[in-house]
Amino acid sequence: NQDLPVIKCVLINHKNNDSSVGKSSSYPMVSESPEDLGCALRPQSAGTVYEAATVEVDVSASITLQVLVDTPGNISCLWVFKHSSLNCQPHFDVQNRGVVSMVILKMTETQAGEYLLFIQSEATNYTILFTVSIRNTLLFTLRRPYFRKMENQDALVCISESVPEPIVEWVLCDSQGESCKEESPAVVKKEEKVLHELFGTDIRCCARNELGRECTRLFTIDLNQTPQTTLPQLFLKVGEPLWIRCKAVHVNHGFGLTWELENKALEEGSYFEMSTYSTNRTMIRILFAFVSSVARNDTGYYTCSSSKHPSQSALVTIVEKGFINATNSSEDYEIDQYEEFCFSVRFKAYPQIRCTWTFSRKSFPCEQKGLDDGYSVSKFCNHKHQPGEYIFHAENGDAQFTKMFTLNIRRKPQVLAEASASQASCSSDGYPLPSWTWKKCSDKSPNCTEDIPEGVWNRKANRKVFGQWVSSSTLNMSEAMKGFLVKCCAYNSLGTSCETILLNSPGPFPFIQDSIS
């Protein structure tokens, strides 16, 4: 066993800064430091087979599998993957160790599997086995964080039961309203699970992993703020923890806070108080009301009272299942070509929704904003004045909601014409939907004013392209009309557009003359 080489297998992760694909052993990429893969002799195997820890790679990630061999003399090698031999070029590092690398760029399903490296040295032959798999993101979850009190301490722990384990951070803000937006300088982030400083104005906890980011705000009643016109409402599902913080500031310590549920004081162990002096020597008190796992009977009005401030309440509603409340009736809008306009959906939902706006099979990011009345709103303004059907879709794990919008852009018709041996056709997409006239041009009517009363067949809205209506009109040709010029005109309240068509004698290529009046 003494003659066996000392083998080190490492994984090098690359931050992709290139989109090319291929395998090579000297590819310029930004690399992270090598990670040991614990190469060990495979127990009870025929021959000398070393094995590395299974490597799990994200789709599109780039990695290098590398072997460092402490063995005297030269080495030769061969990589084998899925019965194909791959070129192998060993080199020696500064410590005179043999180095063999396999670069996998932009990992795909086809690149997952067993990579075998056969090494031949002057002393011995051996095999190294790497198993590379694609990380199974189907098993990944990202759950909204919730709060727990830390045992024997006045502190909150933020928990998110997610896979892979999320990074948890507290997002704190001490000013009001708009200045507490995520990118604001007033916002402080603390990447830790436990928070001791619980006196801030706005406290949120966020968890993030490969699936994204979810946040939960610590529900707060501030007795020094003017109450909202509508009673704040907090929704929870049966079994979830309830946390409400009541906060009050007073010139001195001579005041107390209490919580009541439907005029009954909360039980001992369902609340805890903290107090501190602020920089201007005023006293800040906070009183938490909490229930580790809510039941239906925890529903009701929670009132925070102070001996020095007007009391304020919040309505806590416990539901069996999440919901999305909004009107799902479809809405039609017509706007001018340069009019500013946004679609808007107002909804009440618990848990918070994930949503998308879709148009013409393309999805657009969806932003939502909380309103003072407990409702939220999502707006979509990026329609670029394209008429058609827009879809808002929302879901939150328990409920789904879809709402359809139709956008019509008021504009003059634009006519497209075509002719065949037996008929001439015109179509237009203007809005309001146009009406049609056909005129014949002749010696008697050089300005094409002679109506064609027969053989015209109008089809309104016969074709819906992403919700955009198209109107068409067809003229069936009589023998007598062949060789004449005809004019089809589409008109609506914004104007008229015409096309002139030459009704050919039978032949494969009808001539269409463009003329828009």
Epitope: E51, T54, T131
Partner: antibody
Framework: QVTLKESGPALVKPTETLTLTCTLS??????????VSWIRQPPGKCLEWLAH???????SYSTSLKSRLTISKDTSKSQVVLTMTNMDPEDTATYYC????????????????WGQGILVTVSS | DIQMTQSPSSLSASVGDRVTITCRAS??????LAWYQQKPGKAPKRLIY???SLQSGVPSRFSGSGSGTEFTLTISSLQPEDFATYYC?????????FGCGTKVEIK
């Protein structure tokens, strides 16, 4: 160079919660099938396995201590954290973290690297 | 839980001696067993994994054998640096359990 390093308080009071951190270098729980375990050894006594956590977040706990233990990881900081509630003088021990490697053909290499250990005394 | 019984609990030997330590599992554990060496004030160090595979960098005087319930660690010719306590570990089922150690002392 693979290293594991334990950190945390040397002294805790009875009934308090112990939080220990194991900081990893030279390997990670991010891209390979690996795990980190916690093991303890009371002075002059046997080794006792406490818990471990795998790269895919799979966790296992000692049956006798399960209700008191929580293991978690922060891959971005290369750390594994063990919390043990309601500490008792009987929990006085040297606490070690050690590595487990999961191989492609389904076998596991247990504890090929260990930290140097941290002595935790429980006393009022 | 699987109990691991190590014997002897201590032994005295001289440099150059052949030393055998036994570990018995309360139920079959296939070859899911590792041996560790621990010196005072230090962390354990793995010598053998999978019952009989020698850890890279460990001298070949150490060897392991056995399968099922009976396992042995053998030091073919004891060296001064081998005086230490040796532990076995079963990792066949949870909870993982260690033997209580065999202290090898100088005679």
């Amino acid at each position: 160079q693979v290293t594991l390093k334990e950190s945390g308080p040397a002294l805790v009071k009875p009934t308090e919660t112990l939080t220990l951190t194991c900081t990893l270098s030279g390997f990670s729980l991010n891209n390979a099938r690996m795990a980190v375990s916690w093991i303890r050894q009371p002075p002059g006594k046997c080794l006792e396995w406490l818990a471990h956590i795998f790269s895919n977040d799979e966790k296992s706990y000692s049956t006798s201590l399960k209700s008191r233990l929580t293991i978690s990881k922060d891959t971005s900081k290369s750390q594994v954290v063990l919390t043990m509630t309601n500490m008792d003088p009987e929990d006085t021990a040297t606490y070690y973290c050690a590595r487990i490697v999961g191989y492609g053909t389904g076998w596991y290499g247990f504890f090929d690297y260990w930290g140097q250990g941290i002595l935790v005394t429980v006393s009022s | 839980d699987i109990q691991m019984t190590q014997s002897p609990s201590s032994l005295s030997a001289s440099v150059g001696d052949r030393v055998t330590i036994t570990c018995r599992a309360s139920q079959g554990i296939r070859n899911d067993l590792a041996w560790y060496q621990q010196k005072p004030g230090k962390a354990p160090k793995r010598l053998i994994y999978a019952a009989s595979s020698l850890q890279s960098g460990v001298p070949s005087r150490f060897s392991g054998s056995g399968s099922g319930t009976e396992f042995t660690l053998t030091i073919s010719s004891l060296q001064p640096e081998d005086f230490a306590t040796y532990y076995c570990l079963q990792h066949n089922s949870y909870p993982l359990t260690f033997g209580c150690g065999t202290k090898v002392e100088i005679k």
